[in-house]
């Protein structure tokens, strides 16, 4: 029996490791799983968030894992994608669905960040120059849109590079080649990885790379 | 239809413990469904006291500590509450709910005195 | 526990009056918020659940809204029938909680 306190709880099942799998949720003291209609990745970011997970991957809309069983707790979830837990996005109400079956469970991938490598390039040192991030093993880009100091300021921490001095756009260092992983970030400065801040999903942009991001960090200015 | 039905002494001497059983029709208790007891006050006040769920699991409102166990006895398809050691404050309306996740289906309510 | 704040205790109306009623949450319990009518020598019976659903069969000149900590019950034109004390009531979390109630009366 238990007393009081949240009665909800939430992990990812049957995926490779704790960062990816089937949504369940626990309530009422019953595990049960998510319907994928609607499913979104302002919900994804909510669940890696939660999870300590903080980097949304993919957002599948079925489960990559096995159909999970018993009660279909949440349909239509709709999150903004700051909320703190997948229980503060709007849904259906608890049990509530629309005929939903286990085939629709959503299922989620997030990364711990072990995974994900940055560096800054053609600047000359390693704390100036175009933006690339090592993801799923490939080297690729930022784009330069709405790119700014806040960007710039979680890159130069993130690589114990210093304050950041300067951003640029424009392929300023050079074009890249490969994938572009992120177009319209939004950080507020203060993330521990550019990953973490709020983006619409990886390799997600209408860019190309003569739009490729680069940053001037204090610790490469003064080797510059 | 699921429906409730309250059944209990009336009356209780303070220091006494308490037993109310809710007799459910309609539906099998082990089926589905979390099964509660909320009590309401003189002047209205509601408390959820806690609930026993269809597999058997039960959580309790802290307020009600050691106070408070629920059972239920699957056989005759009722759940039951048991309050020790009560006192004049416990005198309430106690009703058996259940539902989901909501308090969707009610009982019509046991009035309970507690007196010497 | 989250304490639920209902507003007002009691409301003198006439009928065809528009009746609002607001419940205030302690803390955010996001939409998770249910509201009961209770009329005289009955037991509550459930209108609203998750802030604004209504539940079947129960009229849509009742309706509620609000998301965080604020939320309102509103009937649009009150009917004799009507005249009870409707409590909110939040689900998020253990314990379940109550609104103190709002009897509506007759002027």
């Known amino acids: 029996s238990s007393l009081g306190g949240t009665d909800k709880e939430l992990r990812l099942v049957d995926g490779e490791n704790k960062c990816s799998g089937r949504v369940e949720v626990k309530v009422q003291e019953e595990w049960g799983t998510v319907c994928n209609n609607g499913w979104s990745m302002e919900a994804v970011s909510v669940i890696c968030n939660q999870l300590g997970c903080p980097t949304a991957i993919k957002a599948p809309g079925w489960a990559n894992s096995s159909a999970g069983s018993g009660r279909i707790w949440m349909d239509h979830v709709s999150c903004r994608g700051n909320e703190s837990a997948l229980w503060d996005c709007k849904h259906d109400g608890w049990g509530k669905h629309s005929n939903c079956t286990h085939q629709q469970d959503a299922g989620v991938t997030c990364s711990d960040g072990s995974n994900l490598e940055m560096r800054l390039t053609r600047g000359g040192n390693m704390c100036s120059g175009r933006i690339e991030i090592k993801f799923q093993g490939r080297w690729g880009t930022v784009c330069d849109d709405n790119f700014n100091i806040d960007h710039a300021s979680v890159i130069c921490r993130q690589l114990e590079c210093g304050s950041a001095v300067s951003f640029s756009g424009s392929s300023n260092f050079g074009e890249g080649s490969g994938p572009i992983w992120f177009d319209d970030l939004i950080c507020n400065g203060n993330e521990s990885a550019l990953w973490n801040c709020k983006h619409q999903g990886w390799g997600k942009h209408n860019c190309d790379h003569a739009e490729d991001a680069g940053v001037i960090c204090s610790k490469g200015a003064d080797l510059s | 239809d699921v429906q409730l039905q309250e059944s209990g002494p009336g009356l209780v001497k303070p220091s006494q413990s308490l037993s109310l059983t809710c007799t459910v029709t309609g539906y099998s208790i082990t089926s589905d469904y979390a099964w509660n007891w909320i009590r309401q006050f003189p002047g209205n006040k509601l408390e959820w006291m806690g609930y026993i769920t269809y597999s058997g699991i039960t959580n309790y409102n802290p307020s009600l500590k050691s106070q408070i166990s629920i059972t239920r006895d699957t056989s005759k398809n009722q759940f039951f509450l048991q309050l020790n050691s009560v006192t004049t404050e416990d005198t309430a309306t106690y009703y058996c709910?259940?539902?989901?996740?909501?308090?969707?289906?009610w009982g019509q309510g046991t009035t309970l005195t507690v007196s010497s | 526990s989250v304490v639920m704040t209902q507003t007002p205790k009691s409301l003198l109306i006439s009928i065809g009056d528009r009746v609002t009623i607001t419940c205030k949450a302690s803390?955010?319990?996001?939409?998770?918020v249910a509201w009961f009518q209770q009329k005289p020598g009955q037991s509550p019976k459930p209108l609203i659940y998750?802030?604004?659903n209504r539940y079947t069969g129960v009229p849509d000149r009742f309706t509620g809204s609000g998301y965080g900590t604020d939320f309102t019950f509103t009937i649009s034109s009150v009917q004799a029938e009507d005249l009870a004390v409707y409590f909110c009531?939040?689900?998020?979390?253990?314990?379940?909680?109550f609104g103190g109630g709002t009897k509506l009366e007759i002027k």
């Open positions: 803390q955010s319990v996001s939409s998770d």
């Open positions: 009531g939040q689900d998020y979390t253990s314990p379940r909680t």
């Open positions: 998750y802030a604004s």
């Open positions: 709910v259940s539902g989901t996740y909501y308090f969707d289906y």
